[in-house]
Interface confidence: medium
């Protein structure tokens, strides 16, 4: 296994006061049983609201590297391949669960954390505010 | 909290053979510190590739309720509000980590699981296969 400089403040697995602590088996089971899932791997380029992927790294988190979608344009790509500013490219956001080492550097103690990530972009009709 | 009938086969927290097991604190910390994140709440209706949200519930999973997007149309909505079948509405899929009670009904023993969810839809140019 891995040898980690252990934080002396690491909680004891048997500590009954460690709040709402559970045992979690890290052999991640993959429930994506559909043998032909429609992968979104190239949608970022083919979309009328295309996006780029930006890297966000945090060594104390699993997964340590999260690639976030950033819409390429304010508008959407029209049939001529030009940006139409009468429409808006907007990020679709989703909360995901990640694990954070807590206290930091403890090899077998984690905290669940929710973070909001942008998964991709979609093209929407803008909300127009009419001034009286 | 919820009272769950305890499975007599639940693993012992101190069992050193319980595979790749760590302690996880379930007091979920929310890192979405932006007090007004641009939520995608109404994008499902305003998108050129609109979607409906379907509820998926599983009491043995955390989170137990997951909302799944299903694209409303095969094509995309054009400027006239009609469906244009020269373009495709496609789901943007994302894997999320969830916790599954394992063995079932054990209150403090979980397994990490990856599941694929559709978060929303985007409008893409179709891939055209030319037959020789």
């Amino acid at each position: 296994g891995i040898t980690i400089p252990r934080n002396p403040g690491c909680p004891n697995s048997e500590d009954k006061n460690f709040p709402r602590t559970v045992m979690v088996n890290l052999n991640i089971h993959n429930r994506n049983t559909n043998t032909n899932p429609k992968r979104s791997s190239d949608y970022y380029n083919r979309s009328t609201s295309p996006w780029n992927l930006h890297r966000n790294e945090d060594p104390e988190r699993y997964p340590s590297v999260i690639w976030e979608a950033k819409c390429r344009h304010l508008g959407c790509i029209n049939a001529d391949g030009n940006v139409d500013y009468h429409m808006n490219s907007v990020p679709i956001q989703q909360e995901i669960l990640v694990l954070r080492r807590e206290p930091p550097h403890c090899p077998n103690s984690f905290r669940l954390e929710k973070i909001l990530v942008s998964v991709g972009c979609t093209c929407v009709t803008p909300i127009v505010h009419h001034v009286a | 909290g919820i009272t769950i009938p305890r499975n007599p086969g639940c693993p012992n927290s101190e069992d050193k053979n319980f595979p790749r097991t760590v302690m996880v604190n379930l007091n979920i910390h929310n890192r979405n510190t932006n007090t007004n994140p641009k939520r995608s709440s109404d994008y499902y209706n305003r998108s050129t590739s609109p979607w409906n949200l379907h509820r998926n519930e599983d009491p043995e999973r955390y989170p137990s309720v997951i909302w799944e997007a299903k694209c409303r149309h095969l094509g995309c909505i054009n400027a006239d509000g009609n469906v244009d079948y020269h373009m495709n509405s496609v789901p943007i899929q994302q894997e999320i980590l969830v916790l599954r009670r394992e063995p079932p009904h054990c209150p403090n023993s979980f397994r990490l699981e990856k599941i694929l969810v559709s978060v929303g839809c985007t409008c893409v140019t179709p891939i055209v296969h030319h037959v020789a």
Partner: antibody, heavy 126, light 107 residues
């Protein structure tokens, strides 16, 4: 700049054990895993196993199960691969490769090997 | 385990020519397919990750496409320095596996 520096060439006898080190620099050690890949003379690449530093968890190819042990020391940012019960079939170049723990385009951990060590030549001969 | 097959095994190409290498997986692997280049006496080098994503520092003449079971690596305008062996690699499922390699040499 990311670098993986492996220990030097080894000559072993059948039945002996081998331990190769892989020292990582230029990146956060626990943000990545290390996989070990070998290449027999004139042959292709063969994945042996890997370690996810974040969890300290290991995975091994069935072919090497029971014979290979992969460990890591976070304090020295070094990973190790130990292979026991050597035979002449284990003559190969052994590489370590860095494996990101990534959430990429909506998916967890379908990982590429983004940086490789220079390789350690191992000869097993009586 | 997932078996990857590559074609061709060997290709002799003139500089500036277009090179296409294919990789087929024995089962669906989504886009968890990566391409490496290995020059004689050197370590492998990552060229393309997740089927089609380019790597910073890798020349733009290298591109990848495909998903599911069929993947392609394209070198648009081969250069002399591109001689070597190209491997595809799947990480959809343990054990991770590599294709047998395609050797490219310069005429």
């Amino acid at each position: 700049e990311v670098q993986l520096v492996q220990s030097g060439a080894e000559v072993k006898k059948p039945g002996e054990s081998l331990k190769i080190s892989c020292k990582a620099s230029g990146g956060s050690f626990i943000s990545y895993g290390i996989s070990w890949v070998r290449q027999a003379p004139g042959q292709g690449l063969e994945w042996m196993g890997g370690i996810t530093h974040f969890f300290g968890s290991t995975d091994y190819a069935q072919k090497f199960q029971g014979r290979v042990t992969i460990t890591a020391d976070e304090s020295t940012t070094t990973a190790y691969m130990e292979l026991s019960g050597l035979t002449s079939d284990d003559t190969a170049v052994y590489y370590c490769a860095r494996v990101p723990n990534e959430f990429w385009n909506g998916y967890y951990a379908t990982q590429d090997f983004d940086y490789w060590g220079q390789g350690t030549t191992v000869t097993v001969s009586s | 385990e997932i078996v990857l097959t590559q074609s061709p095994d060997f290709q002799s190409v003139t500089p500036k020519e277009k090179v296409t290498i294919t990789c087929r997986a024995s089962q669906e692997i989504g886009f968890a397919l990566h391409w490496y280049q290995q020059k004689p006496g050197q370590s492998p080098k990552l060229l393309i990750k997740y089927a089609s994503h380019s790597i910073s520092g890798v020349p733009s003449r290298f591109s990848g496409s495909g998903s599911g079971t069929d993947f392609t690596l394209t070198i648009n305008g081969l250069e002399a320095e591109d001689a070597g062996t190209y491997y595809c690699h799947q990480t959809e499922e343990l054990p991770y596996t590599f294709g047998p390699g395609t050797k490219v040499d310069i005429k």
